[in-house]
């Protein structure tokens, strides 16, 4: 039975050209995290495997950095980075947990970094 829950930074905004940290946290379960996959819409960005460490997709290597922890840092943000991001936690023995983050990249300096909103 899957008892865990994923907490995320929810809906966040950041300035064009800046950086943002995508963070998810799995709680309320003793399951072992074996791997975390980070996806942007229909693209695999990165994988963190308990045995193998990090793999960053080559096409994102210049702008994606592993960490902190199981999170992911996006750098040199562009307006095209606006959209949904998913953290997919593969755990044993529970199975798979998925968290969602919506990032909006803004042109101006009105971006509110790390703002937390309720995920719909």
């Amino acid at each position: 039975m899957m008892t865990g829950t994923i907490e995320t930074t929810g809906n966040i905004s950041a300035e064009k050209g800046g950086s943002i940290i995508l963070q998810c946290h799995l709680s309320s379960t003793t399951a072992q995290v074996t791997q975390v996959n980070w996806e942007q819409q229909d693209q695999l960005l990165a994988i963190c495997n308990a045995d193998l460490g990090w793999h960053i997709s080559p096409s994102f290597k210049d702008r994606v950095a592993p960490g902190p922890g199981l999170g992911l840092t996006l750098q040199s943000l562009t307006v095209n980075d606006t959209g949904e991001y998913f953290c997919i936690y593969h755990t044993y023995p529970d199975g798979t947990y998925t968290g969602r983050i919506f990032l909006e990249v803004l042109e101006s300096s009105v971006a509110e970094h790390g703002a937390r909103f309720q995920i719909p």
């Epitope: 074996t34 791997q35 229909d42 695999l44 994988i47 495997n49 193998l52 793999h55 997709s57 044993y92």
Partner: antibody, heavy 118, light 107 residues
Framework: EVQLLESGGGLVQPGGSLRLSCAAS????????MHWVRQAPGKGLEWVTS????????SYADSVKGRFTISRDNSKNTLYLQMNSLRAEDTAVYYC???????????WGQGTLVTVSS | DIQMTQSPSSLSASVGDRVTITCRAS??????LNWYQQKPGKAPKLLIY???SLQSGVPSRFSGSGSGTDFTLTISSLQPEDFATYYC?????????FGGGTKVEIK
């Protein structure tokens, strides 16, 4: 250098059993998921079964479920496939493959031929 | 199960030609799509993983694109050693499934 070497194939009668082995070298075997894939003569590739690095997760194709058993011995760097109740349609070359991050099969063995015939 | 439909099933081309092979998934598989090359009597060889990442040691004339349900393998300039059969494979969910293969033959 990563190497995967299958063995144990051969001719067996319908209803018989075989145990395939895949000896791994050149990498930390215990860190990788492993898969078996087969290819019938003149046909395409068919995934058979997979096992996670610590053997916590195992999955089978419907066509072999209940008849085949995948296992691994990380202390011996060896992957196994126990095949029971073999049928003519199981005739194929069987490949073992290393699967980093459970996403792609980056190294394959040379294959071992299993022929099920009376 | 996720069905993978590859087209064409075979094609004839000349050295230097640009070759495109397509693969369609019966449902979205994000970018969990790999391409393999197989020559007669040999094991498959990984070319492209995660839809567009070139496997180490594979020539840059091979490229992959697509996401969701539609994917493409492109060989920019066909070389003599590229005549082989190519397979796509999804790793989005088990059972893992392969396309039926595309045989690239000499014209």
């Amino acid at each position: 250098e990563v190497q995967l070497l299958e063995s144990g194939g051969g001719l067996v009668q319908p209803g018989g059993s075989l145990r395939l082995s895949c000896a791994a070298s050149g990498f930390t075997f215990s860190s990788y998921s492993m898969h078996w894939v087969r290819q019938a003569p003149g046909k395409g590739l068919e995934w058979v079964t997979s096992i996670s690095s610590n053997a916590g997760y195992i999955s089978y194709a419907d066509s072999v479920k209940g008849r085949f058993t995948i296992s691994r011995d990380n202390s011996k760097n060896t992957l196994y496939l126990q095949m029971n109740s073999l049928r003519a349609e199981d005739t194929a070359v069987y490949y073992c493959a290393r699967v980093p991050y459970d996403v792609w099969m980056d190294y394959w063995g040379q294959g071992t031929l299993v022929t099920v015939s009376s | 199960d996720i069905q993978m439909t590859q087209s064409p099933s075979s094609l004839s081309a000349s050295v230097g030609d640009r070759v495109t092979i397509t693969c369609r998934a019966s449902q979205s598989i994000s970018s969990y799509l790999n391409w393999y090359q197989q020559k007669p009597g040999k094991a498959p060889k990984l070319l492209i993983y995660a839809a567009s990442s070139l496997q180490s040691g594979v020539p840059s004339r091979f490229s992959g694109s697509g996401s969701g349900t539609d994917f493409t393998l492109t060989i920019s300039s066909l070389q003599p050693e590229d005549f082989a059969t190519y397979y796509c494979q999804q790793s989005y969910s088990t059972p893992l499934t392969f396309g039926g293969g595309t045989k690239v033959e000499i014209k």
